[in-house]
């Protein structure tokens, strides 16, 4: 960066070469040129020349002022006019940058995926710092009170192999940058409670003529979990508002779920499962799309016939038997 | 050689407009700033609006006595500036000087065009 | 802004004279400085820039010099054409700003 540049001279910031986003600051730039008493000394910014607000101090120092600075990063650097020289000779250049101390962390999640032998967790980091903010995750044992801590840019893995210390945990995150420090709730966790079963797959959907069409959904997961609850929501394409149909599982063979719909329809599906009683939700598995016949005959849709869909769309909340609308936020 | 011709000047009543315009010639267009200059009957110059070169990002400049109230302006393909008055006020009598500058004084200046403003 | 005060505002002399025109600027402007002349009818032209830096084609009777706050412009051997106001100017800080002139009669 400019920072690696040989300098004669010297350039700095105040209040701080990392401040608060907004703030007034000034640069300063002195310049320390053998056989030169400069007469001008001029500013850049991102290789672009500032005309105003330079004021100059001293015969060698001049300062620069910004008011309510608002740039995440710029490079800056200061250049002397000599006598007698046709260019500009290059005295310095720093890195600035601006941006906000971190939001205390919140919603802190933990969640192990069947099979991933890993727990991972999550949580809000607040608004953009716009500058480099470390997060360090504790994990506390509860039974043998040891703590272990993991640095980390944005969310954690840690493998349930170096969670030794029992089944009860305390998670807390703290959140650093240059401009302050801040600290999560504490978050208590029992590794049994937060296990989210191997995730649910569409595989195909049919329907069948009869004297009134009906539409089977096939779907199926890997899970080795025995309790497990399902929701399947679907709608129109063209629709906004999501039905819901809940399901008590058994994955030891592939669910067939059956549903009666408008003819010449494209639907949107979407499964998602959780361990019984559990807190911890599947994220809603990939968009299964089908098109009803228009009459008779009998029409197959398989997974690889999926279309993109951004899977962001609305939630929902399920028991046997059950048919639901529901507009809720995922 | 370099040669810089205003047109646009006249007379305007208060609260009117007029458009001053400079051709410029026979130096990089990018490489200079361009200045409007204005000397009232009998007075000193002032310097009332400037675009800076291209170094600069064309950063523009107006004295405090026309800001939101003139706009220059460049068109490089044109070699022309502009100077848009708008709200004229009898003060802003005078004549004005296209000028150019590569470090900051007017290395070359037009032979000016005169703005009279009065009811 | 930087303030730049002239003296005298006007001032007479013969041909052949010599003469001498000031300007105080209102902080140190570190050379920064031109001055310019302006014949009746006619737009500035550029004397001298730099404080002492002669511009192409003036002729070498003006000369400038000084430093920090006090600047000053003389001219050797008076001659007619150079009946005039003169005027200076800093460059040292943006924007850029003016003497009150100095007006050059001849007797």
């Known amino acids: 960066g400019i920072t690696n540049i040989n300098c004669s001279g010297h350039i700095w910031v105040e209040p701080a070469t990392i401040f608060k986003m907004g703030m007034n600051i000034s640069i300063y730039c002195q310049a320390a040129i053998k056989n030169c008493q400069p007469r001008k000394l001029h500013f850049y910014k991102n290789g672009i020349k500032e005309r105003f607000q330079i004021t100059r101090i001293n015969k060698t120092t001049a300062r620069l002022w910004y008011k309510n600075f608002l740039e995440p990063h710029a490079s800056m650097y200061c250049t002397a006019e000599c006598p007698k020289h046709f260019q500009e000779t290059l005295i310095c250049g720093k890195d600035i940058s601006s941006g906000y101390p971190p939001d205390i962390p919140d919603e802190v999640t933990c969640v192990i995926y069947e099979y991933s032998g890993n727990m991972t967790c999550t949580w809000n980091a607040g608004k953009l710092t716009y500058i480099d903010t470390k997060y360090v995750v504790h994990v506390k044992s509860l039974e043998t009170e040891e703590e272990q801590q993991y640095l980390t840019s944005s969310y954690i893995n840690i493998s349930t192999d170096s969670l030794q210390g029992g089944k009860k945990y305390l998670v807390w995150v703290q959140a650093a940058n240059a401009l302050g420090m801040e600290e999560s709730k504490q978050l208590q966790i029992h590794l049994d409670d937060i296990v989210i079963p191997s995730a649910a797959v569409i595989s195909r959907a049919e329907t069948i003529n009869a004297t009134v069409p009906k539409t089977i959904i096939y779907w199926d997961s890997q899970t080795t979990i025995e309790k497990v609850s399902c929701e399947m929501r679907y709608k129109a394409t063209t629709n906004q508002t999501w039905n819901v149909k809940e399901f008590d599982t058994n994955f030891t063979y592939v669910q067939q779920s059956e549903f009666y719909l408008e003819p010449n329809i494209k639907y949107v599906f979407q499964v998602r499962c959780q361990e019984t009683g559990k807190r911890y939700w599947q994220p809603w598995s990939s968009p299964f799309f089908h098109k009803t016949p228009e009459t008779v005959p009998q029409v197959t849709s398989k997974a690889f016939q999926h279309d993109t869909w951004n899977s962001g769309l609305t939630v929902a909340s399920i028991s046997t038997g059950h048919l639901t609308s529901d507009n809720r936020g995922d | 050689e370099v040669k810089l011709v205003e047109s646009g000047g006249g007379l305007e009543q208060p609260k009117g407009s007029l458009k001053l315009s400079c051709t410029v010639s026979?130096?990089?267009?990018?490489?200079?700033?361009m200045s409007w200059v204005r000397q009232a009957p009998g007075k000193g110059l002032d310097l009332v609006a400037d675009?800076?070169?291209?170094?600069?990002?064309?950063?523009?400049y107006y004295a405090d006595s026309v800001k939101d109230r003139f706009t220059i302006s460049a068109d490089d393909s044109q070699s022309m500036v502009y100077l848009e008055m708008d709200n004229l006020k009898t003060e802003d009598t005078a004549l004005y000087y296209c000028?150019?500058?590569?470090?900051?004084?007017?290395?070359?200046w037009g032979q000016g065009v005169m703005v009279t403003v009065s009811s | 802004d930087i303030q730049m005060t002239q003296s005298p505002a006007s001032l007479s002399a013969s041909l052949g004279e010599t003469v001498s025109i000031e300007c105080l600027a209102s902080?140190?402007?570190?050379?920064?400085l031109a001055w310019y002349q302006q014949k009746p009818g006619k737009s500035p032209q550029l004397l001298i820039y730099?404080?002492?830096s002669l511009q192409d084609g003036v002729p070498s009777r003006f000369s400038g010099s000084g430093s920090g706050t006090q600047y000053s412009l003389k001219i050797n051997s008076l001659e007619s054409e150079d009946a005039a106001t003169y005027f200076c100017?800093?460059?040292?800080?943006?924007?850029?700003?003016f003497g009150g002139g100095t007006k050059l009669e001849l007797k």
């Open positions: 730099h404080a002492s």
């Open positions: 026979g130096f990089d267009f990018n490489s200079y700033g």
């Open positions: 902080e140190d402007i570190y050379n920064n």
């Open positions: 100017l800093q460059d040292s800080e943006y924007p850029p700003t």
């Open positions: 000028t150019v500058h590569h470090s900051d004084y007017f290395e070359y």
């Open positions: 675009i800076n070169s291209k170094s600069y990002n064309y950063a523009t």
